[in-house]
Interface confidence: low
């Protein structure tokens, strides 16, 4: 049998696990689609991203709202040919997520 | 130009972007590789794993240390011939994290 | 309050090699992003930048000197250490460490270097 | 390396009347990000020089507005609206688009 303490602590995990923006690590430049001879430092910065589980296999968690934050950075050009400069960066930051049914496909793709 | 206290923000944003054990919700199913008439509720746990970005293309943000922590789930089998059960479910949780160079690859892989 | 000072030896001999240390405090060389430098000036004359180093140890060299000079820095003093060898007459100057932003914002008061025999 | 090319060498001023500095680059100093990295600095005597215009026109902190700068690709000038006795020193021009990092020669404006 099971008591109602160990279905707390279940049902809190699965809270925890489910589809909402979550704190994730973005790489700048695949995020831009900058061109080779650019790159950032830091290549990374912290956004919120949709993540975590849905209950259906049909369903995915996506985003439903996005703001875009400003990320200040250093945009190096290679090779180096001046100071690194700070330049203000927008990304994409999820700011609501919902459990929603994948794109239908096409039946011959 | 830029001032140190510019720098320091980005300075902390880059320590926590870097590659270290992560909070993530992965799915117990596809983890253990069950047969696709077991299930488990919640279909998905929250433990540790490697993320983050490294310093360079060429490494990648692999595990050094894994522990097996244990999760009560319940575990259904279809068609339902009895009632739900719980089980402990071992899973992986990165403890120790590293950049890692990545396998090196066949030149006609 | 950021400053930053120069230090080393007022005299050296020709074919010489010259060390010279920055300290600095009011930021740390371990900060994302951070660098420091060196500029001269001869007596009366242009500045002129040599080299710099930067949080993650990538270092930068004026071409015309770089087989000159070496850069290096010591992160838990506070300090970066400039060599310059083979030194000539001609390299009579005072020596500016700088904190690297663009553009230089911070200097040191400059120490003078005279080179002779 | 980019020379870069300051006239006057010297410049007496009056006390009140304005100056005017010119620099000159031997190549254009917009870099591929479309900024200009044109500086200017002010060196008193027996002084560090210190930062007066950074990119071309925008004023560092604390500078008084009588400093001006202007210009875009190899020519740039600096400007005192109405000079005053503590303005004397050797203005210099620096580029940081190209390395080396480079600079002018320097103009020493004095009170007549």
């Known amino acids: 049998f099971y008591d109602i303490e160990t279905l707390k602590v279940i049902d809190e995990e699965w809270q925890r696990t489910q589809c909402s923006p979550r704190e994730t690590c973005v790489e700048v430049a695949s995020e831009l689609g900058k061109s080779t001879n650019t790159f950032f430092k830091p290549p990374c910065v912290n956004v919120f991203r949709c993540g975590g589980c849905c209950n259906e296999e049909s369903l995915i968690c996506m985003n439903t709202s996005t703001s875009y934050i400003s990320k200040q950075l250093f945009e190096i050009s290679v090779p180096l040919t001046s100071v690194p400069e700070l330049v203000p960066v927008k990304v994409a930051n999820h700011t609501g997520c919902k459990c929603l049914p994948t794109a239908p496909r096409h039946p011959y793709s | 130009f830029y001032d140190i206290e510019t720098l320091k923000v980005i300075d902390e944003e880059w320590q926590r972007t870097q590659c270290s054990p992560r909070e993530t919700c992965v799915e117990v199913a596809s983890e253990l590789g069950k047969s696709t008439n077991t299930f488990f509720k919640p279909p998905c746990v929250n433990v540790f794993r490697c993320g983050g970005c490294c310093n360079e293309e060429s490494l990648i943000c692999m595990n050094t240390s894994t522990s097996y922590i244990s999760k009560q789930l319940f575990e259904i089998s279809v068609p339902l011939t009895s009632v739900p059960e719980l089980v402990p479910v071992k899973v992986a949780n990165h403890t120790g994290c590293k950049c890692l160079p990545t396998a090196p690859r066949h030149p006609y892989s | 309050q950021v400053t930053l000072k120069e230090s080393g030896p007022a005299l050296v001999k020709p074919t010489q090699t010259l060390t010279l240390t920055c300290t600095f405090s009011g930021f740390s060389l371990s900060t994302y992003g951070m660098g420091v430098g060196w500029i001269r000036q001869p007596p009366g004359k242009a500045l002129e930048w040599l080299a710099n180093?930067?949080?993650?140890?990538?270092?930068y060299y004026n071409p015309v000197l770089q087989d000159r000079l070496t850069i290096s820095k010591d992160t838990s003093k506070n300090q970066v250490v400039l060599t310059m060898t083979n030194m000539d007459p001609v390299d009579t100057a005072t020596y500016y460490c700088v904190q690297v932003t663009n553009p230089f914002v911070f200097w040191g008061q400059g120490t003078l270097v005279t080179v002779s025999s | 390396d980019i020379v870069m090319t300051q006239t006057p060498l010297s410049l007496p001023v009056t006390p009140g009347e304005p100056a005017s500095i010119s620099c000159r680059s031997s190549q254009s100093l917009v870099h591929i990000n479309g900024n200009t990295y044109l500086h200017w600095y002010l060196q008193k005597p027996g002084q560090s020089p210190q930062l007066l215009i950074y990119?071309?026109?925008n004023r560092f902190s604390g500078v008084p507005d009588r400093f001006s700068g202007s210009g875009s690709g190899t020519d740039f000038t600096l400007k005192i609206s109405r000079v005053e006795a503590e303005d004397v020193g050797v203005y210099f021009c620096?580029?940081?688009?190209?390395?080396?990092?480079?600079f002018g020669g320097g103009t020493k404006v004095e009170i007549k």
């Open positions: 990119k071309v026109s």
């Open positions: 180093i930067w949080w993650n140890d990538d270092k």
């Open positions: 620096s580029q940081s688009t190209h390395v080396p990092w480079t």
